[in-house]
Amino acid sequence: GWVWNQFFVPEEMNTTSHHVGRLRSDLDNGNNSFQYKLLGAGAGSTFIIDERTGDIYAIEKLDREERSLYILRAQVIDITTGRAVEPESEFVIKVSDINDNEPKFLDEPYEAIVPEMSPEGTLVIQVTASDADDPSSGNNARLLYSLLQGQPYFSVEPTTGVIRISSKMDRELQDEYWVIIQAKDMIGQPGALSGTTSVLIKLSDVNDNKPIFKESLYRLTVSESAPTGTSIGTIMAYDNDIGENAEMDYSIEEDDSQTFDIITNHETQEGIVILKKKVNFEHQNHYGIRAKVKNHHVDEQLMKYHTEASTTFIKIQVEDVDEPPLFLLPYYIFEIFEETPQGSFVGVVSATDPDNRKSPIRYSITRSKVFNIDDNGTITTTNSLDREISAWYNLSITATEKYNIEQISSIPVYVQVLNINDHAPEFSQYYESYVCENAGSGQVIQTISAVDRDESIEEHHFYFNLSVEDTNSSSFTIIDNQDNTAVILTNRTGFNLQEEPIFYISILIADNGIPSLTSTNTLTIHVCDCDDSGSTQTCQYQELMLSMGFKTE
């Protein structure tokens, strides 16, 4: 049978030929009659065999990390017969390890983030080195980790590569650290190989700083003309923290006048002082308010850093603005009776300069030929007024400062022209009536109504009468209906077209004004030739028919 021990060849042997071991048949008596052969991958190129002795040699430098075993086949032949002495057999050559690989950190680059002020012992990151040598071969791949840079803030566990905090760190002093870790194989014994890696450790922020005003006093100004909501200036606190931990909120701590407000610009972290109520230089020309600032987000466990909010004082000076004249009222309504003579008094408007210098005021009326105003604000008429032409006047009165004519204010003034009874009532329309020759007494000829151009205080009431002459000799009579209308009736039987073709009746209409006014109005009545039934359709009075729009036969 075959005789051999397990074959080992050390890696990285530089000799041209390294004896690995000997293969032999127990039938080999050493008389050189046997021939040994090596077959398989590596035979002849990596390994050779002495055909006579069966000694195997490695003729190539081997790398265990590349390939750690070779399976070869061996044959032994009797030279004299050419026959196999032993059956072909497989054998294994193992490549034994030497410490020729340094530890390598394959997961580089390393970066870790840990909160500032973390307590001692806090885990930061684990670094792991790999050693290509054989972990089962002595200590060639057994590693020890140590810290080359990073004391006194960090430490590394020698066997695990776990980096921990060994001293509290303040991000506001230093926000990142470079730690250098060394891994040594052979558990650090002589002849060990080493590799290093750098770990960038960044400190994340915790809210351990409150915002603080750098200025204890701010001086701001606001124009008295500024509308509410105006930004009048900014204040700024500083927080050494970053991001969300530096977000702050400003607020008013003291403002007795409740005139100002502070809003926070969360992009710039500035406080914007806002005008909440209009200011008036003449009323108060300076203010003092106190503002405070605190962080927007504060964790419960960090409240100890935020016990007392930082404050600052803000002095606000009101700037005087030359303001336009100010009328006592926003508008005026005056009344004047119609028909009062030119120059009559209408009313007085009054404006003053609100500023301290109290400039005299001049008044004017925009585009009016009917009214005038003097420097005292007295409005008078320049013409007699007729309510029936215009019952209201809308005036625009302008007040101008004498010392600064650009300072102008205008207000509306409404003048109501009051009614006097200066118009008598009159027919509401032109009336032309007719009567049949054969009309009987008491026949209704016409209903009339009246109008009065005057304004009625309560309600117009008109009184209708015939004139004295007509009352005495009239063929007609009038009845007042007591509702501002009256009816005209025949006062006799029968009329003669040839003798009296037309009657002109004078009607008096009086109003209920004080004093009462009366007008005389003429009613024209035509006499018509009518048929027996009294139908006006057959009235043959040509001129009348034409005037009434009838066609004559």
């Epitope: 077959l39 398989g40 991958a41 590596g42 035979a43 190129s45 790398d63 990390e65 590349e66 390939r67 750690s68 075993l69 399976i71 086949r73 072909e88 497989e90 390598k104 394959l106 290509a132």
Partner: antibody, heavy 120, light 108 residues
Framework: QVQLQESGPGLVKPSQTLSLTCTVS??????????WSWIRQHPGKGLEWIGY???????YYNPSLKSRVTISVDTSKNQFSLKLSSVTAADTAVYYC????????????WGQGTLVTVSS | EIVLTQSPGTLSLSPGERATLSCRAS???????LAWYQQKPGQAPRLLIY???SRATGIPDRFSGSGSGTDFTLTISRLEPEDFAVYYC?????????FGGGTKLEIK
């Protein structure tokens, strides 16, 4: 797990050099115990081993192609490459990259393959 | 170079049947150095068996390998529809590495 992906031109002119790259993901090319190999398959035919490389740069080639083949490795990019010079139409094939277990010689895993056509 | 000869070139069987594929080496090959692969159209080969008889990760137990020296066999005990493909053997016992010509397993 380890994955391999071939890349390179799909068309090469005769007499020129075919160049392919295999990118390894999910593991390091610098791991011991593995060769990184190229295999090709002519259309409708069997598989032919071209050669392999260890991360140290040591190469092993098929003697039938040795004069024209160069395999190289870039451990920083986790890639290895194949160059085949003086190509002819007979080099038209699907080219695969694969990982080889150095002690026992089996291929696992494989890339999905890339067809290279040699034509003018 | 070791030449691997696979037989039959084509094998026609039905699902549920047993398939026996042969791989013969021109020289003796260590069983540690013989592997089998499956290849479906348009796909890369997939490792089935290594060391002549060890199943690769995720390979169903209906696949088995055997043999030594120069004669090696791949057996599929009960064919499933997804098993119809081309099968290759490969050796590492002698340089250069070589593959067999393949056996096409088709549905009957």
């Amino acid at each position: 797990q380890v994955q391999l992906q071939e890349s390179g031109p799909g068309l090469v002119k005769p007499s020129q050099t075919l160049s392919l790259t295999c990118t390894v993901s999910g593991g390091s090319i610098s791991s011991g115990g593995y060769y990184w190999s190229w295999i090709r398959q002519h259309p409708g035919k069997g598989l032919e081993w071209i050669g392999y490389i260890f991360y140290s740069g040591r190469t092993y080639y098929n003697p039938s192609l040795k004069s024209r083949v160069t395999i190289s490795v870039d451990t920083s990019k986790n890639q290895f490459s194949l160059k085949l010079s003086s190509v002819t139409a007979a080099d038209t094939a699907v080219y695969y990259c694969a990982r080889v277990y150095s002690n026992y010689g089996w291929f696992d895993p494989w890339g999905q393959g890339t067809l290279v056509t040699v034509s003018s | 170079e070791i030449v691997l000869t696979q037989s039959p070139g084509t094998l026609s069987l039905s699902p549920g049947e047993r398939a026996t594929l042969s791989c013969r080496a021109s020289q003796s090959v260590s069983s540690s150095y013989l592997a089998w692969y499956q290849q479906k159209p348009g796909q890369a080969p997939r490792l089935l068996i290594y060391g002549a008889s060890s199943r690769a990760t995720g390979i169903p137990d209906r696949f088995s390998g055997s043999g030594s020296g120069t004669d090696f066999t791949l057996t599929i005990s009960r064919l499933e529809p997804e098993d119809f493909a081309v099968y290759y053997c490969q050796q590492y016992g002698s340089s250069p590495l070589t593959f067999g010509g393949g056996t096409k397993l088709e549905i009957k």
